[in-house]
Interface confidence: medium
């Protein structure tokens, strides 16, 4: 999906309003120094591409993030403010429903969400002008 035509200001507002709290809740009890930030992004569409990938693409050691509250809100936000996004996700959602996995918060998942927090911050910093 090409995120170029999203309403970035509205996505930023949704992040500040609700998604950030869910990410903080998920990461509660860990420190940023526990993980190395290895994922970055260079502009707004690129940040959203990386955010989508880390949030919704299962990895061998972290398969369940898409069911977390922050992921559900991220999906709703992208569907709301990125034209045509929801249509591109229908097949992916149906495929996910067939692979029901036990919900486990592994260290790998915590590392992945730590990366997400960094990507969201980077997304916002590409929106804002230094005063």
């Amino acid at each position: 999906y090409d995120f170029t035509n999203c309403d970035f200001q509205k996505i930023e507002a949704d992040y500040l309003r609700t998604i950030s709290k869910d990410l903080i809740t998920y990461m509660s009890g860990t420190k940023s120094t526990d993980f190395n930030n290895t994922v970055s992004c260079s502009n707004r569409p690129h940040c959203l591409t990386e955010i989508q990938s880390l949030t919704f693409n299962p990895t061998p050691r972290c398969a369940s993030l898409a069911k977390e509250m922050f992921a559900r809100k991220t999906k709703a936000t992208l569907a709301l403010w990125c034209p045509g996004y929801s249509e591109t996700q229908i097949n992916a959602t149906q495929a996910m429903k067939k692979r029901r996995k036990r919900k486990v918060t592994t260290n790998k998942c915590l590392e992945q969400v730590s990366q997400l927090l960094g990507l969201w911050r980077r997304f916002i910093r590409t929106l804002l002008k230094k005063q």
Epitope: S20, T30, S114, R121, I124, L128, K129, Q131
Partner: nanobody, 127 residues
């Protein structure tokens, strides 16, 4: 549960002072370098940014309407952020909220719509 609890509000005469506190529970301000800010909402008005503090380098930002009168500070050992309010005016009357993850080092204090994590604390400036 992740929560922010604001306290320290009350009734004060014009020219008086108050110190507001914002205490975090369920997470630690320092853990992810969370930026923290104070916002306020007066009856019938939109919420506005008052002040914020960067958790990375301690940089502070203030709305023009409070510069020179309000001071924001943090105590990571107590997981609390403070707003010292001096020379209070009737127009400072509002419910004051704190919020995290607002990147105050990038934009100073700007208005945005957020769901308050706490109940806020009411400040009334009146003679």
């Amino acid at each position: 549960e992740v929560q922010l609890v604001e306290s320290g509000g009350g009734l004060v005469q014009p020219g008086g002072s108050l110190r507001l506190s914002c205490a975090a529970s369920g997470f630690t301000f320092a853990d992810y370098d969370y930026d923290i800010g104070w916002f306020r909402q007066a009856p019938g008005k939109e919420r506005e940014g008052v002040s914020c503090i960067s958790n990375r380098d301690g940089s502070t930002y203030y709305a023009d309407s409070v510069k020179g009168r309000f001071t924001i500070s943090r105590d990571n050992s107590k997981n609390t952020v403070y707003l010292q309010m001096n020379s209070l005016r009737p127009e400072d009357t509002a419910v004051y909220y704190c919020a995290v993850e607002i990147h105050c080092d990038d934009y100073g204090v700007e208005n945005f719509d957020f769901d308050p994590w706490g109940q806020g604390t009411l400040v009334t400036v009146s003679s």
